[in-house]
Every structure is written in structure tokens, then in C-alpha cells.
Interface confidence: medium
Amino acid sequence: ERLCHPCPWEWTFFQGNCYFMSNSQRNWHDSITACKEVGAQLVVIKSAEEQNFLQLQSSRSNRFTWMGLSDLNQEGTWQWVDGSPLLPSFKQYWNRGEPNNVGEEDCAEFSGNGWNDDKCNLAKFWICKKSAASCSRDEEQFLSPAPATPNPPPA
């Protein structure tokens, strides 16, 4: 029996999207490339629920993890890789005293219970995001059952 699985193998499903948590490390720009290579985007966070989910994944694995947010275009103006600005309500996710731009820290990472700005050339883990498959057409992915990845409760 073939079961519909909305995400590729080793990706995690959450609220209509698929997420890939890397097991290797790259700098921020190379992380963008790595996500593009698999038809995805370095993660752009759109809601508090999504943030809580991703923060939990990162903190559970105790990893510093790139997200698709930087102020490379203009110092102090944080922008997602899809061009959207950082929403006011998202400022609360910065860790205490961050972003501090110490030594040209222009790229954002998951760090502990919140966000930190760090040097973009540092190698870190990364998270890719893409829309989940609807599994309603022949070309969608039909895979054998994947390991269950239940949605965790909000942080």
C-alpha cells in the first residue's frame, strides 16, 4: 500500500510546509544555495506558531542554526530572503541584548531560546522550507510511511 506523505523523506511537516534541518554546516550564503538546490528557501518565518516550532527544533538539538534573515542590504534593517521586512511583533524573538552587530554580525540564527545575529561567513546548521505536497495528483510524492513527526506544543 502506498501512503501519501506531504514532505520528502527526512523533512518535517508543520502547518502546510516542509522543513529540512541540516546535519552539516555551511555559511549563511551557502545555506541559501543549499536550500535552492532542493527547491526550497532558507527558512522565512511567517507566524508565531512557526517560530515556536522552529525554535523548539533548534533548541532541542542544541544547534546554532541559520534562518533566512539578515541586515546585509542596510545595517539595522532586518529583511527576509524573500524580500519581506521583519514584522514588529517578531522583534521579541531576539535574545537579550540582540541584535548587537558586534564585529559586523549581519545574519540571524536560532540560538537557545531566541535569535542572535552573527557573522555571515561562519558555518552553522540551517533550515530549509518549502510548501508541502497536496498528494492530490499523480505527480505528487507517494512514499512509504515516514517516521512520525508530531507537531510539538508551543514553546
Partner: antibody, heavy 122, light 106 residues
Framework: QVTLRESGPALVKPTQTLTLTCTFS??????????VSWIRQPPGKALEWLAL???????YYSTSLKTRLTISKDTSKNQVVLTMTNMDPVDTATYYC??????????????WGRGTLVTVSS | DIQLTQSPSTLSASVGDRVTITCRAS??????LAWYQQKPGKAPKLLIY???SLESGVPSRFTGSGSGTEFTLTISSLQPDDFATYYC????????FGQGTKVEIK
């Protein structure tokens, strides 16, 4: 010790502009994550958020009052100023300033001033 | 704008009672909710942030819970100092307060 203190006129006339000053100590509005807000409370009624200014000078206003409000800061003086134009008797309220702390637990108000009562009357 | 609705508006209780106040949001606010206590003529005082985290110095009889659109503030054993008005506040999208719940002596 962290303190906030509101100051301004106790009485303003209808159509006039209200200017309120929040003077604070024990923290700096140049520290990442720190914000100062203005909140008001008409007598016997609920709290109403008015405006907020961030450490990086981003400003946010209540949707219903944004055309009448301006918030600004003077980091060197440890002050935040709110101006509210075209005052009306319904704007009679106690006006509070409050701090938003730095950190990843959100932008709530952890410390408040005592408030200043502003009456709008001719 | 996100609206917060508190219930009940007024609550009559006695010392030692367990008291529960509910706050409902018009849309999901995750756990970005705070609770404040206000006494007549005084500024509000922060009790709970991020739905369930107790502010430093606040007695442990105050507990917050909930996520999404429904939240509660519970006082496990009401003390004389707890008779006051309580407000919830969301900070998921800008900032809004509930209309308040007055806890009065029965």
C-alpha cells in the same frame, strides 16, 4: 533601580495638543530590545495601548489614534515624549508610560510609571 | 486588530477561594500573552508573561495557562491583597488589553 515618571499638564482644553514626557532611569533606550510605550486609562475603564518606540527608533501607533499621535525619544536625556493632537473630553484619562524588557520572552510591559491624570475640559 | 475578551467582568469571591479568569483572543496569539493586576489609583503590575511564566517576586499562587486563543489566570487561594482588577494583554501583533476582570469581596 528602574523607575519611570510621567509629566505633563493636568488640564488641557479641547482642540489643544497634549505633550507628555516620560523620564526614566535604571535602563537605556539604546539597549537592543528595550522599548517604551504609552498606555492610557479613562476613569473607571480599561487600559488602552497608544504608542511604542523601540531602541532602534522604530515607532508603532494605535490604529484608531495614529493620525493624532507622535512618539519620540531623547536617549541622552532618558526621555520619551508623546504628543496627541486635537484633544477631546473623551481623552480624559490617566496616561502611563511603561517599559518593554529585552529578551526573547516577548514585548510585554514589565515596569510602569505611576501615571499622570490628564483632564480635557474647557 | 486583535481583540481580547475577558470573563467574567466581575467576580465575587472569599479569602481562600480558587479563582479563575478567562481571556479569549479573536485570533491565535500563540503564547504571547501577559496578565496584570491593578489596584485603585495604582499602576498595573505584571504578574505573568508568555502565558505561563511567573514574573519575579510574584507569589506562586498565581498561575497562567493556555495557548492559541484561550488563556486562564488562576489564583489558587485568594488572599486579602488579591482583591483588584486583572487585565490580560496580547503582544503577538501590536498590543491590546482585555476589558478587565474585577475580583471583589463576596
Amino acid at each position: 533601580q528602574v523607575t519611570l515618571r510621567e509629566s505633563g499638564p493636568a488640564l488641557v482644553k479641547p482642540t489643544q495638543t497634549l505633550t507628555l514626557t516620560c523620564t526614566f532611569s535604571g535602563f537605556s533606550l539604546s539597549t537592543s530590545g528595550i522599548s517604551v510605550s504609552w498606555i492610557r486609562q479613562p476613569p473607571g475603564k480599561a487600559l488602552e495601548w497608544l504608542a511604542l518606540i523601540d531602541w532602534d527608533d522604530d515607532k508603532y501607533y494605535s490604529t484608531s489614534l495614529k493620525t493624532r499621535l507622535t512618539i519620540s525619544k531623547d536617549t541622552s536625556k532618558n526621555q520619551v515624549v508623546l504628543t496627541m493632537t486635537n484633544m477631546d473630553p473623551v481623552d480624559t484619562a490617566t496616561y502611563y508610560c511603561a517599559r518593554t524588557p529585552s529578551g526573547s520572552y516577548g514585548r510585554y510591559f514589565d515596569l510602569w510609571g505611576r501615571g499622570t491624570l490628564v483632564t480635557v475640559s474647557s | 486588530d486583535i481583540q481580547l475578551t475577558q470573563s467574567p467582568s466581575t467576580l465575587s469571591a472569599s479569602v481562600g477561594d480558587r479563582v479563575t479568569i478567562t481571556c479569549r483572543a479573536s485570533q491565535s496569539i500563540s503564547n504571547w500573552l501577559a496578565w496584570y493586576q491593578q489596584k485603585p489609583g495604582k499602576a498595573p503590575k505584571l504578574l505573568i508573561y508568555k502565558a505561563s511564566s511567573l514574573e519575579s517576586g510574584v507569589p506562586s499562587r498565581f498561575t497562567g495557562s493556555g495557548s492559541g486563543t484561550e488563556f486562564t489566570l488562576t489564583i489558587s487561594s485568594l488572599q486579602p491583597d488579591d482583591f483588584a482588577t486583572y487585565y490580560c494583554q496580547q503582544y503577538n501583533s501590536y498590543w491590546t488589553f482585555g476589558q478587565g476582570t474585577k475580583v471583589e469581596i463576596k
